[in-house]
Interface confidence: medium
């Protein structure tokens, strides 16, 4: 059992779960729904959840919904990464994954969506109202960052209402383009949810082990130029974020930790170890249509014995940043 | 310790084409992209475009579309870029430069640059 | 494209002063990095992700700034410095430099 945060609730079918027709019926509306709720650009879905076993354990998925090849993913609390925002993880499809306490296991889900669980005592643990942010970056197109947050009286055990669209920070300048068939397709997906009100939704069983299970996602646009859509970034309870961590940046270390922008995020304490990730299903959902993860089995493993990761002396030296060319 | 290494300059005629290398060493050659840029006699910097060598296709500038194309061969950690229907406006200093993701997308190493001079 | 504005384009100054030279874009970036470029040499990553110096560059050098506005300082100028700093942003396609910044030493 666990609350859940979605932004908004919506599950799109997956492949298998219905039959022939109730999936074909059900599939018009989701495509529909993406493409007014995207209008043209790439997507960042965020959903955060809290175990209600465990009520200092958080569990934040992400996803990429655009056709770019992501390169780079950056997990925040406290706000967007670059604007106050701590870093808990980062994520590199070749190099592998970086995380810091509170994070205790990151992982890529498929090619396109990645998971972190969080857990913490005291000062370094999240809380209802903390804000966590997921930016993808796919080079040189750009990059998306979407935030969401637990409803701060979502009750562990409850389903969570719907919160407001996430806090969302494109980078990039895309186009809206509102076309004449996409309004028409609006209206008819208006037409169609109202119909489908009035008939029961059939009950789908999430099964905890496949990566095909039926996943809540948080949909919402990406905003296609930062003076399009004014949304202030959540503040947060300032007793949820870490308190010990250290502001410092000795410049020209050769470590990744001296490397973190200090603008863009706190030095975590602490050492952080790159995790072992498993490569994605070939049947997990992938909205990645291009050559990064075009077969799955080339990906390079992440670590291993023998693996130097960063062969170059200067290693890598800052959190952010892009790559993944389409 | 990270290299890259240029061919050498090129003096070419109007309307040929000519094709550049780069050879990187001394680190995981498919972990970083590649980028080509080019800076004209004087002049700033303008980024061409840049090529992953585990993907293979290149990303370009929408300005240099047409112009250059970029490759990647992999078993010799080299990638290459080839100017078409060259004019005397691509005469410049090329340079292929290694990006960093982790740093924001910047330059971390560059190539010493290849001359190209066009002219009849 | 994000078209990235430096100024001045050339800067006088005498060993010990504190100079600043700016980079605006005309349009939100995430991060910029600066580049030292010496006649015939290749540039050289200079300060990456806006405030993070790059390997074997003086403490005397600091960058800051977000949005669309930028700055590298350098607290006392010495002779070594004198060169044109370029800078450069990654936010959207395609990746842009500023026109540069001379700096010469009176």
């Known amino acids: 059992m666990r609350t859940e945060a979605q932004v908004p609730a919506l599950q799109p079918p997956e492949p298998g779960l219905e039959g022939a027709m109730g999936h074909r019926t059900l599939v018009l509306p989701w495509v529909l729904l993406t493409l007014c709720v995207t209008a043209g650009t790439p997507e960042v879905w965020v959903q955060v959840r809290m175990e209600a076993t465990e009520l200092s354990s958080f569990t934040i998925r992400c996803g990429f919904l655009g056709s770019g090849s992501i390169s780079l993913v950056t997990v925040s609390w406290g706000g967007p990464n670059g604007a106050g925002g701590t870093t808990l993880a980062v994520l590199h499809p070749e190099r592998g994954i970086r995380q810091w306490a509170p994070a205790r296991q990151a992982r890529w889900e498929t090619q396109s969506s990645i998971s972190l669980i969080l857990e913490g005592s005291g000062a370094s643990s999240p809380c209802a109202n903390t804000t966590f942010c997921c930016k993808f970056a796919s080079f040189p197109e750009g990059s998306w960052e979407a935030c969401g947050s637990l409803p701060p009286s979502s009750d562990p055990g409850l389903s969570a209402p719907p919160t407001p669209a996430p806090i969302l920070r494109a980078d990039l300048a895309g186009i809206l383009g509102v076309s004449g068939v996409l309004l028409f397709g609006c209206v008819y997906l208006l037409h169609l949810l109202r119909r489908h009100k009035h008939r029961p939704a059939p009950r789908l069983q999430p099964s905890r082990t496949s990566p095909q299970a039926p996943r809540a996602r948080a949909w919402a646009p990406s905003q296609a130029s930062q003076a399009a859509l004014h949304v202030p970034y959540a503040t947060i309870n300032t007793s949820c974020r870490p308190a010990t961590l250290d502001t410092a940046h000795p410049h020209g270390g050769p470590s990744w930790w001296a490397s973190l922008p200090t603008h863009a995020a706190h030095r975590p304490q602490g050492p952080a170890a790159w995790a072992s990730t498993p490569i994605p299903a070939r049947g997990s959902f992938v909205s990645v249509e291009n050559g990064l993860y075009a077969q799955a089995g080339e990906r390079p493993p992440h670590t291993g014995p023998g693996l130097t990761l960063f062969p170059d002396p200067r290693g890598p030296r800052a959190m952010e940043g892009p790559l993944g060319v389409r | 310790e990270v290299q890259l290494q240029q061919s050498g300059p090129e003096l070419v005629k109007p309307g040929a084409s000519v094709k550049i290398s780069c050879k990187a060493s001394?680190?995981?050659?498919?972990?970083?992209?590649k980028n080509w840029v080019k800076q004209s006699h004087g002049k700033s910097l303008e980024w061409i475009g840049a090529?992953?060598?585990?993907?293979?296709?290149?990303s370009y500038n929408q300005k240099f579309k047409g112009k250059a194309t970029l490759t990647v061969d992999k078993s010799s950690s080299t990638v290459y870029m080839e100017l078409r229907s060259l004019t005397s406006e691509d005469s410049a200093v090329y340079y292929c430069?290694?990006?960093?993701?982790?740093?924001?997308?910047?330059?971390?190493?560059w190539g010493q640059g290849t001359t190209l001079t066009v002219s009849s | 494209q994000i078209v990235l504005s430096q100024s001045p384009a050339l800067l006088s100054a005498s060993p010990g002063e504190k100079v600043t030279m700016t980079c605006r874009a005309n349009?939100?970036?995430?991060?910029m990095h600066w580049y030292q470029q010496k006649p015939g040499s290749s540039p050289k990553p200079w300060i990456y992700?806006?405030?993070n110096l790059a390997s074997g560059v003086p403490a005397r050098f600091s960058g800051s700034g977000s949005g669309t506005s930028f700055s590298l300082t350098i607290s006392r100028v010495e002779a070594e410095d004198a060169a044109t700093y370029y800078c450069q942003q990654w936010t959207s396609n395609p990746l842009t430099f500023g026109a540069g910044t001379k700096l010469e030493l009176k």
């Open positions: 992700a806006t405030s």
């Open positions: 349009s939100s970036v995430n991060y």
């Open positions: 001394g680190y995981t050659f498919t972990h970083y992209y």
């Open positions: 430069a290694r990006s960093d993701d982790y740093g924001g997308y910047y330059f971390d190493y």
């Open positions: 090529i992953n060598p585990n993907i293979g296709g290149p």
